[in-house]
């Protein structure tokens, strides 16, 4: 399987909420001994490899934000820790994997990475990640919404 990022750039005003999304593409093994570990973290555009550096999101590490579930299951972070920081990660039946960040501030701007690992009975088999940029802009009215786009094209849509 591969990970796709439907949008590579999210531009949001301060105070808004945003949902960053990654999507699993290709065949996903749903055997009884196959599980998936999914998480999010901040990074920087490295010289060699994007997403190689790991930084916390609002002081929460990749392990704090992870989901671990069977190939046929949906999941979301239910623990209070993430929600106290205005964060929630979720995964649905269709391969969509997201993190929602509430009440954005300028400090949330940066590169975000999703990581998906296929685990076959205790063994980490396949690791893939996706990257996207979040730009939080100051001084916009609270009525304005986030815009999501692919940097290489001019199309953009209003994001949740």
């Amino acid at each position: 399987f591969k990970v796709a990022t439907p949008y590579s750039l999210y531009v949001c005003p301060e105070g808004q909420n945003v949902t960053l999304t990654c999507r699993l593409l290709g065949p996903v093994d749903k055997g009884h001994d196959v599980t998936f570990y999914k998480t999010w973290y901040r990074s920087s555009r490295g010289e060699v490899q994007t997403c190689s550096e790991r930084r916390p999101i609002r002081n929460l590490t990749f392990q704090d934000l992870h989901l671990h579930h069977g190939g046929h299951q949906a999941a979301n972070t239910s623990h209070d820790l993430a929600q106290r920081h205005g964060l929630e990660s979720a995964s649905d039946h269709h391969g969509n994997f997201s993190i929602t960040m509430r009440n954005l501030t300028l400090l949330d701007s940066g590169l975000y990475c999703c990581l998906v690992v296929e685990i076959r009975h205790h063994h980490s088999e396949h690791r893939v990640h996706g990257a996207m940029e979040l730009q939080v802009q100051a001084g916009k009215g609270s009525g304005s919404t986030c815009m999501a786009s692919n940097e290489q094209d001019s199309d953009s849509i209003t994001a949740a």
């Epitope: 671990h68 990581l115 980490s124 690791r127």
Partner: antibody, heavy 121, light 106 residues
Framework: QVQLQQSGAELMKPGASVKISCKAT????????IEWVKQRPGHGLEWIGE????????NYNEKFKGKATFTADTSSNTAYMQLSSLTSEDSAVYYC??????????????WGQGTLVTVSA | QIVLSQSPAILSASPGEKVTMTCRAS?????MHWYQQKPGSSPKPWIY???NLASGVPARFSGSGSGTSYSLTISRVEAEDAATYYC?????????FGGGTKLEIK
Amino acid sequence: QVQLQQSGAELMKPGASVKISCKATGYTFSRYWIEWVKQRPGHGLEWIGEILPGSGSTNYNEKFKGKATFTADTSSNTAYMQLSSLTSEDSAVYYCAGEEVYDGYPWFGYWGQGTLVTVSA
Amino acid sequence: QIVLSQSPAILSASPGEKVTMTCRASSSLSYMHWYQQKPGSSPKPWIYATSNLASGVPARFSGSGSGTSYSLTISRVEAEDAATYYCQQWSSNPYTFGGGTKLEIK
């Protein structure tokens, strides 16, 4: 905070059986494998087998088939290992360990304090 | 089964020294885990997936290797590092540990 609390030391007669418990707190017990490990002085660590509490699925090291039996009670978040037909070779510290998936890599992330089983006539 | 052979069995070092212990596998592995155990205590997760330090492990520890050969290195040994270190594979049943390397501090 994840904790695995094991039952206390046991002094057993040869030929008897013993049942060791491992109570888990602080995580979703049913979803992660519980591993059992044997340690004899000078023999290092030896994997006995594992149980997935939610399904009751088990895997055994061939060497311990017929010797160890795993069960789990999800209502009390407790896993059990029964050792049968005890001999002096079974005298050891037995650990339960909880699988942790860290950074996408499963490993023996959480350990009980160990249960000493002594087999003596 | 995959046999993990650790060497040396006992390693003696003075504080500040650099030490390396090795773990050789009888079959090629994708990665290796390491655990630290002190006398009278349970093993602790120490290095995961060959080279990644568990939370709270001092940066003087490092791990490396691939295939059948893996190693754990301490750049400057401290007294608190005295322990036995075990490598472990979770690639195939039965899951196995190495025999351990006991690190003694002079």
